[in-house]
Amino acid sequence: AGVFELQIHSFGPGPGPGAPRSPCSARLPCRLFFRVCLKPGLSEEAAESPCALGAALSARGPVYTEQPGAPAPDLPLPDGLLQVPFRDAWPGTFSFIIETWREELGDQIGGPAWSLLARVAGRRRLAAGGPWARDIQRAGAWELRFSYRARCEPPAVGTACTRLCRPRSAPSRCGPGLRPCAPLEDECEAPLVCRAGCSPEHGFCEQPGECRCLEGWTGPLCTVPVSTSSCLSPRGPSSATTGCLVPGPGPCDGNPCANGGSCSETPRSFECTCPRGFYGLRCEVSGVTCADGPCFNGGLCVGGADPDSAYICHCPPGFQGSNCEKRVDRCSLQPCRNGGLCLDLGHALRCRCRAGFAGPRCEHDLDDCAGRACANGGTCVEGGGAHRCSCALGFGGRDCRERADPCAARPCAHGGRCYAHFSGLVCACAPGYMGARCEFPVHPDGASALPAAPPGLRPGDPQRYL
């Protein structure tokens, strides 16, 4: 057992051009806090995957208000260390995610709002008991400077916190064959209790006579790397003198997944699919509960009353993410029909409808054309309670009785050029716009925005489990 400690030194604009705007303002004072998430091994995992080694949240930093006109300085930080206790052996290799969160303290509806400002991640090797390691990570235009270390909690010592120390039985020296416990020179290393031959580098024990393996090692004495093992008899063209490598015990042999998890082999190792309420490399960690307050921004924690059941955050409209931490641009979901203009008022969405349409989402088509006629082949278009004629080429006016230039009204938006055509006018759009009247901006990735998912949801997964 031991503790991983993280000390944040600074969070502010990184070097180079494009300094970020301060996240706080006179109108919207805010303060920062940090979250660290640790996972064993060097695996590339999604940010949302569980923090199997543990997680911690810092205190809130001092309230900060930007000085008008001043560049964003390093922001005031919370006091103290972030500490993540670990119960078992320190794995030696680990992945981390450090998130910088902003708590907005303006007088917005609902009290403080939380938003994720920056997220950095990395994979490191670290021996327990070593000195502080310093690091700098960049997230966009922001830079985070921090130090970290892992230390063992007595009586554990060693680079994996697996050796145990006990107070000396005699005042002057340790028992036969036992060394003093550096740095606790007044204590002695406890007698070896692991299974005889258990690898000191890759194995550890918590009970006498057992040998538990660190990640990447297997076998009764943790001496076999996962997925390969020396073979004693030759295979095929290989000779007995040269030896060979054959697949060793399968990584799923003996099912390393605890708590009913199911094991599946991966190219480099194995993967446990954990039952509801458990996570971690081997499903050994029981879940965060609702009592831990995991839902931000007014989210309601559902389920997760105890560590054996996972929780879900039901997010208020306007927020999404497994912890309701992401603000949604609800207008990006294009909720307004029939060309209505979307307004996100914070407390609600509003659609400003084009003429001829009504309803909360402009879904109702007003019938203005009943009994109306348009001359010269014009067609009646419903609109705003009064009929309008869409006239054939060369005609205009309320009832299409006047001869007209179809381009006279400058119908092409955003600098598009208008051409008269036998079937009507044609717009040649300026770069970056599209549509019959060049009314739609083309998104930077070349695709127009499509409705993704309703507010508070992940696409295709309305009830996201952590």
Partner: antibody, heavy 118, light 108 residues
Framework: QVQLQESGPGLVKPSETLSLTCTVS????????WSWIRQPPGKGLEWISY???????NYNPSLKSRVTISVDTSKNQFSLKLSSVTAADTAVYYC????????????WGQGTLVTVSS | EIVLTQSPGTLSLSPGERATLSCRAS???????LAWYQQKPGQAPRHLIY???SRATGIPDRFSGSGSGTDFILTISRLEPEDFAVYYC?????????FGGGTKVEIK
């Protein structure tokens, strides 16, 4: 100003299903979560269920096996069904709007008394 | 579920006096996700306070909320005749949403 109006029979026989509808005016039902709360005569408030237009629902575990909540966005209405009722289900039933800043209730209907009796 | 216990059950006071109503939770409520409501006979509840201490739109400033964790207070600084009613607290941290049993503020 948003208004909510409960409607449904005021008298239901034991073992039958209680059905109520809440009609929302002056706001789109798609903007909010919507909820049902009840209050037995002379007693306190009990949350029953809520729904979001996308289909997210949540139920009070004490009633979950008997409750169904649904939404009709085209009519701007949401509904409650409570099956196998007994006299203990006699209460004033309120529909309410859940705010966008948290799961509390900022607008309520005036309530409808449902009596379970043969 | 989080059980909310309100005390006292009944509070007998005169207009102009200060009322202090308590709401205690069976477990800590994260980020002070607690609301207060007022209910008069024959009427629906009226929302007063959210986030333990923020007043809802249109609520007079004689109503104030405080507290965090497990202990929350609703204070009415000077009782007006229209303030005599039943007051409920509600937590919105964890499902199921739960209400306290209510405190009746009656005229002495």
């Amino acid at each position: 100003q948003v208004q909510l109006q409960e409607s449904g029979p005021g008298l239901v026989k034991p073992s039958e299903t209680l059905s109520l509808t809440c009609t929302v005016s002056s706001d789109s039902i798609s903007n909010y979560y919507w909820s049902w709360i009840r209050q037995p005569p002379g007693k306190g408030l009990e949350w029953i269920s809520y729904i979001y237009y996308s289909g997210i629902t949540n139920y009070n575990p004490s009633l979950k096996s008997r409750v169904t909540i649904s939404v009709d966005t085209s009519k701007n209405q949401f509904s409650l069904k409570l099956s196998s009722v007994t006299a203990a289900d006699t209460a004033v039933y309120y529909c309410a709007r859940i705010t966008v800043t948290g799961f509390y209730f900022d607008y309520w209907g005036q309530g409808t008394l449902v009596t379970v009796s043969s | 579920e989080i059980v909310l216990t309100q005390s006292p059950g009944t509070l007998s006071l005169s207009p102009g006096e200060r009322a202090t109503l308590s709401c205690r939770a069976s477990q800590s409520i994260s980020r002070s996700y607690l609301a207060w409501y007022q209910q008069k006979p024959g009427q629906a509840p009226r929302h007063l306070i959210y986030g333990a201490s923020s007043r809802a739109t249109g609520i007079p400033d004689r109503f104030s909320g405080s507290g965090s964790g497990t202990d929350f207070i609703l204070t009415i600084s000077r009782l007006e005749p229209e303030d005599f009613a039943v007051y409920y607290c509600q937590q919105y941290d964890t499902s199921p949403l739960t209400f306290g049993g209510g405190t009746k503020v009656e005229i002495k």
